[in-house]
């Protein structure tokens, strides 16, 4: 029965006398008067079985002690660690000349585990063991025992097992512990390849080449190899494995990506958080699923956010010129998170009496620069029929628009060809003038020629002579122009817009801002 003692991971113990409970029962020759098994107490007051001999008075001592058979377990080289205490011959009275301070270590290889006698001539000498000059002080009970540790190695071994023997030649000695072990390179994982327990080679300089196997959920990148050195250390790792898609390296293992993370390829990268607007509900995701209403285009990388179709374009303006229409619009408020936005134009020709009866315009209509895939926010449509109602739809599209089952990304305008733009505004008045502002008001055009959508006020400093002007748009028939300079002459023009386009600007209204805080009320067309 052996108790557990902790040794380095690269050592495999074949015999440990300290772990044996009860008598060791090794064979001594002679049976009496030579080596004797003695129990002593260690520092924890636990008995240790030791062998001692102290035949220091008689010359020519030849006392042998042999271990039980020791299996070699496939090891080709074994190590023998002997802890012993040796008494100074000087401390023993009257023994000069007969007392020695060394002993000899032997081994004998055998396939027979039950050899009963010691045949000295079968044994091969390993070494003569002497106490080092430096002893280790070890508490044994209340005493300080001088413990010496010596390690020797033997190899190559070839038989199933072997015996060790200790020859005393007249020393006063106690073998406190005998441990026999071999060295292995312990099971390890390097570069995601597992290398098995590997017994070291026969020579102290030999290297054993070992091929590793990729850990679970990984694959070879380059063939993983390492070398097991004679001291039980792994050397020179070559090659490696990579975690499969959906897995990342954690603590030397390939573990599944956590929920909310993914990994698309077999690389040495870690799992990445799902891109915006996507999720994973299982561990080990190789890609993330787009949120409802979000999509991933065919050529989008798994690392890209999920995106959605754009919202409708804004501020669609039409300008009809006989049988041509110019359309202009603003980019959608929401591009869906994509840069590949473009615009498609749909033209429908509608009946005058019933606008719901519309049909495609056909191939006779021409679009500049093009009808579909527009990158700009304007288009010119020509070759329309005169005096006809047309509905134009501007569709904003991007790389994922085709996946959207409920498209609502268009804005439309209905125009009638040849419809006149509004007439100019006849009367513009400055209702209130201060140092920094002018309040304007005006009448609707005499001929609106349709629904007035908005008014545009253009103004500039008189001496700039229209080189630098500003525009203000409003749906009302009045506006406050603010942020003006005091004592400065400004010129104002106003024009109206219908669905058909802008009318002409009004005649200029010249107004000079005040120098004093008091307000000046004017109602003429040219207040100064």
């Amino acid at each position: 029965v052996t108790g557990s003692r902790v040794y380095p991971a690269n050592e495999v113990t074949l015999l440990d006398s300290r772990s044996v409970q009860g008598e060791l029962g090794w064979i001594a020759s002679p049976l009496e008067g030579g080596w004797e098994e003695v129990s002593i107490m260690d520092e924890k007051n636990t008995p240790i079985r030791t062998y001692q001999v102290c035949n220091v008075m008689e010359p020519s001592q030849n006392n042998w002690l042999r271990t039980d058979w020791i299996t070699r377990e496939g090891a080709q080289r074994v190590y023998i660690e002997i802890k012993f205490t040796l008494r100074d011959c000087n401390s023993l009275p009257g023994v000069m000349g007969t007392c020695k301070e060394t002993f000899n270590l032997y081994y004998y290889e055998s396939d027979n585990d039950k050899e009963r006698f010691i045949r000295e001539n079968q044994f091969v000498k390993i070494d003569t063991i002497a106490a080092d000059e430096s002893f280790t002080q070890v508490d044994i009970g209340d005493r300080i025992m001088k413990l010496n540790t010596e390690i020797r190695d033997v190899g190559p071994l070839s038989k199933k097992g072997f015996y060790l023997a200790f020859q005393d030649v007249g020393a006063c000695i106690a073998l406190v512990s005998v441990r026999v072990f071999y060295k292995k390179c312990p099971l390890t994982v390097r570069n995601l390849a597992q290398f098995p327990d590997t017994i070291t080679g026969a020579d102290t300089s030999s290297l054993v080449e070992v091929r590793g196997s990729c850990v679970n959920n990984s694959e070879e990148k380059d063939v993983p190899k390492m070398y097991c050195g004679a001291d039980g250390e792994w050397l020179v790792p070559i090659g490696n494995c990579l975690c499969n898609a959906g897995h990342e390296e954690r603590s030397g293992e390939c573990q599944a990506c956590k929920i909310g993370y993914y990994k698309a390829l077999s690389t040495d990268a870690t799992c990445a958080k799902c891109p915006p607007h996507s999720y994973s509900v299982w561990e080990g995701a190789t890609s993330c699923t787009c949120d409802r209403g979000f999509f991933r285009a065919d050529n989008d990388a798994a690392s890209m956010p999920c995106t959605r179709p754009p919202s409708a374009p804004l501020n669609l303006i039409s300008n009809v010129n006989e049988t041509s229409v110019n359309l202009e619009w603003s980019s959608p408020q929401n591009t869906g998170g994509r840069q590949d936005i473009s615009y498609n134009v749909v033209c429908k020709k509608c009946g005058a009496g019933d606008p719901s009866k519309c049909r495609p315009c056909g191939s006779g209509v021409h679009y500049t620069p093009q009808q579909n895939g527009l990158k700009t926010t304007k288009v010119s449509i020509t070759d329309l029929l005169a005096h006809t109602n047309y509905t134009f739809e501007i569709w904003a599209v991007n790389g994922v628009s085709k996946y959207n089952p409920n498209p609502d990304q268009s804005v439309s305008v209905t125009v009638t060809t040849n419809q006149a733009a509004p007439s100019s505004i006849a009367l513009v008045q400055a209702k209130e003038v201060t140092r920094y502002s002018v309040a304007l008001a005006w009448l609707e055009p005499d001929r609106p020629n349709g629904v007035i959508l908005e008014y545009e006020v253009k103004y500039y400093e008189k001496d700039q002579n229209e080189r630098s002007y500003r525009i203000v748009r409003t749906a009302a028939r009045n506006t406050d122009i603010k942020g003006l300079n005091p004592l400065t002459s400004y010129v104002f023009h106003v024009r109206a817009r219908t669905a058909a386009g802008y009318g002409d600007f009004s005649e200029p209204l010249e107004v000079t801002t005040n120098t004093v805080p008091s307000r000046i009320i004017g109602d003429g067309a040219n207040s100064t």
Epitope: Q52, C54, V56, L92, V95
Partner: antibody, heavy 121, light 106 residues
Framework: QVQLLQSGAEVKKPGASVKVPCKAS????????MSWVRQAPGQGLEWMGW????????TYAQGFTGRFVFSLDTSVSTAYLQISSLKAEDTAVYYC??????????????WGQGTLVTVSS | EIVLTQSPATLSVSPGERATLSCRAS??????LPWYQQKPGQAPRLLIY???TRPTGIPDRFSASGSGTDFTLTISRVEPEDFAVYYC????????FGQGTKVEIK
């Protein structure tokens, strides 16, 4: 088994001599030193000295030089204690004891049964 | 020469009790200190050597400790056959015994 056999009691007159034998058996006589110990009636143990059975070299304790002699006959595995010019205060039990040297320490591990020497006129 | 002083001179204990005997040296004797037991009319018997090692055949109720100048012999549970005189001894240049401690029945 290992044993030391001593002779029976001796009664001597003052001034006489006595030779107490100690015969060893069960082990190699010359491999262990032999020690001599005196115990006066009702008293404690008193170490007299020892003899190296291999070389025959004796060592005497203080107070046991001159009249006390340790000797050997290795051919019969016997150690001897000879006391000359006996005095009344030499009356005691005399023990031979085998000396055991060990790496852990020393001790007298095997004792003879003792020989009572009585010195009386 | 080194003087060994044992205490107490007499120790009265009942069977089953613990007995602790002391031996003090006038100067350090390292750990080379044996203990002996002597019963009336018998030769002494080696109980402990090297301050704490028991020879074969000595019951494990006998234990000893100490080094330098202070040593102790302990009988964990005194048996009827343990009533005797106990001596310590030192192995200096000259070997000497303590005067002995008598363990008697209480």
């Amino acid at each position: 088994q290992v044993q030391l056999l001593q002779s029976g009691a001796e009664v001597k007159k003052p001034g006489a001599s006595v030779k107490v034998p100690c015969k060893a058996s069960g082990y190699t006589f010359t491999s262990r030193a032999m020690s001599w110990v005196r115990q006066a009636p009702g008293q404690g143990l008193e170490w007299m000295g020892w003899i190296n059975t291999n070389t025959g070299n004796p060592t005497y304790a203080q107070g046991f030089t001159g009249r006390f002699v340790f000797s050997l006959d290795t051919s019969v595995s016997t150690a001897y204690l000879q006391i000359s010019s006996l005095k009344a205060e030499d009356t005691a039990v005399y023990y031979c004891a085998r000396v055991r040297f060990t790496v852990y320490g020393d001790g007298m591990d095997v004792w003879g049964q003792g020989t009572l020497v009585t010195v009386s006129s | 020469e080194i003087v060994l002083t044992q205490s107490p001179a007499t120790l009265s204990v009942s069977p089953g009790e613990r007995a602790t005997l002391s031996c003090r040296a006038s100067q350090s004797v390292s750990s080379n200190l044996p203990w002996y037991q002597q019963k009336p009319g018998q030769a002494p018997r080696l109980l402990i050597y090297g301050a704490s090692t028991r020879p074969t055949g000595i019951p494990d109720r006998f234990s000893a400790s100490g080094s330098g100048t202070d040593f102790t012999l302990t009988i964990s549970r005194v048996e009827p056959e343990d009533f005797a005189v106990y001596y310590c001894q030192q192995y200096g240049p000259s070997w000497t015994f303590g005067q002995g401690t008598k363990v008697e029945i209480k």
